[in-house]
């Protein structure tokens, strides 16, 4: 038997992936655990093996189909269970009725590229990945720029309150190396959270022309 508090948190990427983290205070030496997904209206069900990510937490990804296939809708509820092997039996350790479109976390934006760079400004674009057509334009973005001598945590957040997959960074310093990241969040869903940050895009502003201020 396992004692201690348990936390079971899952997010849907809006297409064909449910990522789950299960935390358990009590020790679970060498126990095999998995997450089982059972939708209330669909024919498929899916299982993934929980793998340790720290001393007391495990994670896994339920792959529901091809990355861009729409496997769930706003009407679906998925029963998610954490099952751990106890001898020859499986014991239910945690269970939740999961509403996918109330618990969204999209994939990080991809394909970041510099569209145009000058001495004091830089225009950057990106794409969203594996995002459902249900959102239409109901997405928002946050962006941050890493300046020399600073950390990501110190970088001010720029908020784009609409589906705008580009930004024009202003008031940059000439001939300076910067890094840029962006993340995305649907407006829908009570427990929806920000995507992970994108891979950083490194760019350098152009040097100031000689003889100019």
């Amino acid at each position: 038997a396992v004692n201690g508090t348990s936390q079971f948190t899952c997010f849907y990427n809006s297409r064909a992936n449910i990522s789950c983290v299960w935390s358990q205070d009590g020790a679970l030496q060498d126990t095999s655990c998995q997450v089982h997904a059972w939708p209330d209206r669909r024919r498929w069900n899916q299982t993934c093996e929980l793998l340790p990510v720290s001393q007391a937490s495990w994670a896994c990804n339920l792959i529901l189909g091809a990355p861009d296939s729409q496997k769930l809708t706003t009407v679906d509820i998925v029963t998610l269970r954490v099952l751990c092997r106890e001898g020859v039996r499986w014991r239910v350790m945690a269970i939740q009725d999961f509403k996918p479109f109330e618990n969204l976390r999209l994939m990080a934006p991809i394909s970041l590229q510099v569209v145009h760079v000058e001495t004091h400004r830089c225009n950057i674009s990106w794409e969203i990945s594996q995002a459902s057509h249900y959102f239409e334009r109901h997405l928002e973005f946050e962006a941050r720029t890493l300046s020399p001598g600073h950390t990501w945590e110190e970088a001010p957040l720029l908020t784009l309150k609409q589906k705008q997959e580009w930004i024009c960074l202003e008031t940059l310093t000439p001939d300076t190396q910067y890094e840029f990241q962006v993340r995305v969040k649907p407006l829908q869903g009570e427990f929806t959270t920000w995507s992970p940050w994108s891979q950083p895009l490194a760019f350098r502003t152009k040097p100031a022309a000689l003889g100019k201020d």
Epitope: R43, S69, Q70, T73
Partner: antibody, heavy 116, light 107 residues
């Protein structure tokens, strides 16, 4: 095998109510949504609503909101559809069906005739 | 509500013919599209679910394809027992909606 057996034909007066039953067998009743669809003679199909027997959760087509009530009795694996304030255009066949990636099993249908 | 437009409303074909019915949704429904068969005086039978999944016990001459708003239902070689009305239905969002039906007759 999965079976949905509906109650027999009914004749009702305008303004009255009708309650159609749908008895399920051959599967775990509480694990699948039961949906209700109606069909006028020689006409198309109209979704009325659905109910999840495991929780009693319901969804209704707004067209019928306030007139239709879906319930279940899990002890006898039976779903019910009650339609109130009947009108002559409610003279149609009512079907129950199990939902599992489409409506995979259907009842035989219940004809309700509304006539004064 | 999502409107489902089926065409043709009726068609006549010979035994052995390839028969195609189309269904168009008024908005993107991804692959949440099902096809049903109804013979005269009978209840409905599910043939195809999630655009192309063949329901248990359904002959392989029935197939479906499409995505988004445009869908196709095909009978590769028409048999006498296929005489029926065929309906498409979306289960992408409530209220679920059906096409108006295609009545298939033998020439």
């Amino acid at each position: 095998q999965v079976q949905l057996v509906q109650s027999g034909a009914e004749v009702k007066k305008p303004g009255a109510s009708v309650k159609v039953s749908c008895k399920a067998s051959g599967y775990t009743f509480t694990s699948h949504w039961i949906t209700w669809v109606r069909q006028a003679p020689g006409q198309g199909l109209e979704w009325m609503g659905d109910i999840y027997p495991g929780s009693g959760n319901t969804n209704y087509n707004e067209k019928f909101q306030g007139r239709v009530t879906l319930t279940v009795d899990t002890s006898i694996s039976t779903a019910y559809m009650e339609l109130s304030r009947l009108r002559s255009d409610d003279t149609v066949v009512y079907y129950c069906a199990r939902e599992r990636g489409g409506f995979d099993y259907w009842g035989q249908g219940t004809l309700v005739t509304v006539s004064s | 509500d999502i409107q489902m437009t089926q065409s043709p409303s009726s068609l006549s074909a010979s035994v052995g013919d390839r028969v195609t019915i189309t269904c168009q949704a008024s908005q993107d429904i991804s692959n949440f599209l099902n096809w049903y068969q109804q013979k005269p005086g009978k209840t409905l039978k599910l043939l195809i679910y999630y655009t192309s999944g063949l329901h248990t016990g359904v002959p392989s001459r029935f197939s479906g394809s499409g995505s988004g708003t445009d869908f196709t239902f095909t009978i590769s070689s028409l048999q006498p027992e296929d005489i029926a009305t065929y309906y498409c239905q979306q289960d992408n969002n409530h209220p679920y909606t059906f096409g108006q039906g295609t009545k298939l007759e033998i020439k």
